[in-house]
Amino acid sequence: RKAVLDCEAMKTNEFPSPCLDSKTKVVMKGQNVSMFCSHKNKSLQITYSLFRRKTHLGTQDGKGEPAIFNLSITEAHESGPYKCKAQVTSCSKYSRDFSFTIVDPVTSPVLNIMVIQTETDRHITLHCLSVNGSLPINYTFFENHVAISPAISKYDREPAEFNLTKKNPGEEEEYRCEAKNRLPNYATYSHPVTMPSTGGDSCPFCLK
């Protein structure tokens, strides 16, 4: 009789579909992730099962707390879609699909500098390129550890470019660039490139 009542309750939407979620949607290959399957009904003993497409990945029982499934995303096909099944006795409901987005991390960018030197000014062109990493890649240029450009989004594999004009400085200046994509908390920096002061003829990047 209890099973019958549960099934009738499900049919009247008193037993809604479970919710499947993860703290991160964007992952890189090899990353460990936790998936949470939860239900609004906190009083029933619920059996949660996780599926990727039609493959059963695991089952947990829970009451009031979400079921936590720990996985490792190692291959592209493991991005999803995932589904969670909530079952009470012989009755079950499925969550909506959840898929991860697999993103390749950016590699350390390379910074190139070209300078056109005039008597009073330096016209500086900075180029920054990370040769690997999922697009878009956001590049930011720094001078002496201070950002001098907005984030420049690149949707192709060509370098980001930033131009600036400076009065001939009396001191050395250090430039570097940062590359980051949608992977959270994952940014890489180029090696610093030092521009010498204008004393003497030492300007290795200069086009006279």
Epitope: V26, P81, D97, S99, T101, V131, S134, L135, P136, S153, K154, Y155, D156, R157, E158, N181, R182
Partner: antibody, heavy 119, light 110 residues
Framework: EVQLVESGGGLVQPGGSLRLSCAAS????????MNWVRQAPGKGLEWIGM???????FYANWAKGRFTISRDNSKNTVYLQMNSLRAEDTAVYYC?????????????WGQGTLVTVSS | DIQMTQSPSSLSASVGDRVTITCQAS??????LAWYQQKPGKAPKLLIY???TLASGVPSRFSGSGSGTDFTLTISSLQPEDFATYYC????????????FGTGTKVTVL
């Protein structure tokens, strides 16, 4: 399973307009670049343009001005608006999703929709 | 802009033959090149990406090589289902684009 389904093709008179749709399922278009590619009868593949996550669009030189790509996130659908159509625009139009959020290989294609421009 | 030139434009071969198609970019595109197969009335199918990585489900008789400006698609032993048109595509630059795709190579039965 990721699927792309184009619709909106058909017969249109020279100078007319047409809007093609590409409905995506199994993929979040805010993370991937969606492209439009066409193929005239007996000819090769021709890239038209793409729309990326932030709604930014890129076009082939020849497509700028007459072709506009847009997106409706709530419907997970991308559109191709074609204006001032000419006979040489007669082609099968495909939408194709890249493996990345920018320029990339196109790993999933729709079935194509035929556009015929004729009086 | 980057132009992609394929050669030959067509070739005839027999089942079991080794077939090689080349694609040349007008400037360096590193290894950002893809190859597609297309059969009449069908959408193109991705074969190879990043110049040499086989797409999921593609038979190992297909292989790709090259970097910079010169690339090659090789079919080690042609099968009946391989008679089709093949296209290369640059995935490097969005600057001043006329077309991403090469001109195509049609492989027909000898």
């Amino acid at each position: 399973e990721v699927q792309l389904v184009e619709s909106g093709g058909g017969l249109v008179q020279p100078g007319g307009s047409l809007r093609l749709s590409c409905a995506a399922s199994g993929i979040d278009l805010s993370y991937y670049a969606m492209n439009w590619v066409r193929q005239a009868p007996g000819k090769g593949l021709e890239w038209i343009g793409m729309i990326v996550g932030g709604g930014i669009t890129f076009y082939a030189n020849w497509a700028k001005g007459r072709f506009t790509i847009s997106r409706d996130n709530s419907k997970n659908t991308v559109y191709l608006q074609m204006n001032s159509l000419r006979a040489e625009d007669t082609a099968v139009y495909y939408c194709a999703v890249g493996s990345d959020g920018g320029i990339s290989d196109f790993n999933i294609w729709g079935q194509g929709t035929l556009v015929t421009v004729s009086s | 802009d980057i132009q992609m030139t394929q050669s030959p434009s067509s070739l005839s071969a027999s089942v079991g033959d080794r077939v090689t198609i080349t694609c040349q970019a007008s400037q360096s595109i590193s290894s950002y090149l893809a190859w597609y197969q297309q059969k009449p009335g069908k959408a193109p199918k991705l074969l190879i990406y990043r110049a040499s990585t086989l797409a999921s489900g593609v038979p190992s008789r297909f292989s790709g090589s090259g970097s910079g400006t010169d690339f090659t698609l090789t079919i080690s032993s042609l099968q009946p289902e391989d008679f089709a048109t093949y296209y290369c595509q640059q995935a490097y630059s969005l600057s001043n684009v006329d077309n991403f795709f090469g001109t195509g190579t049609k492989v027909t039965v000898l």
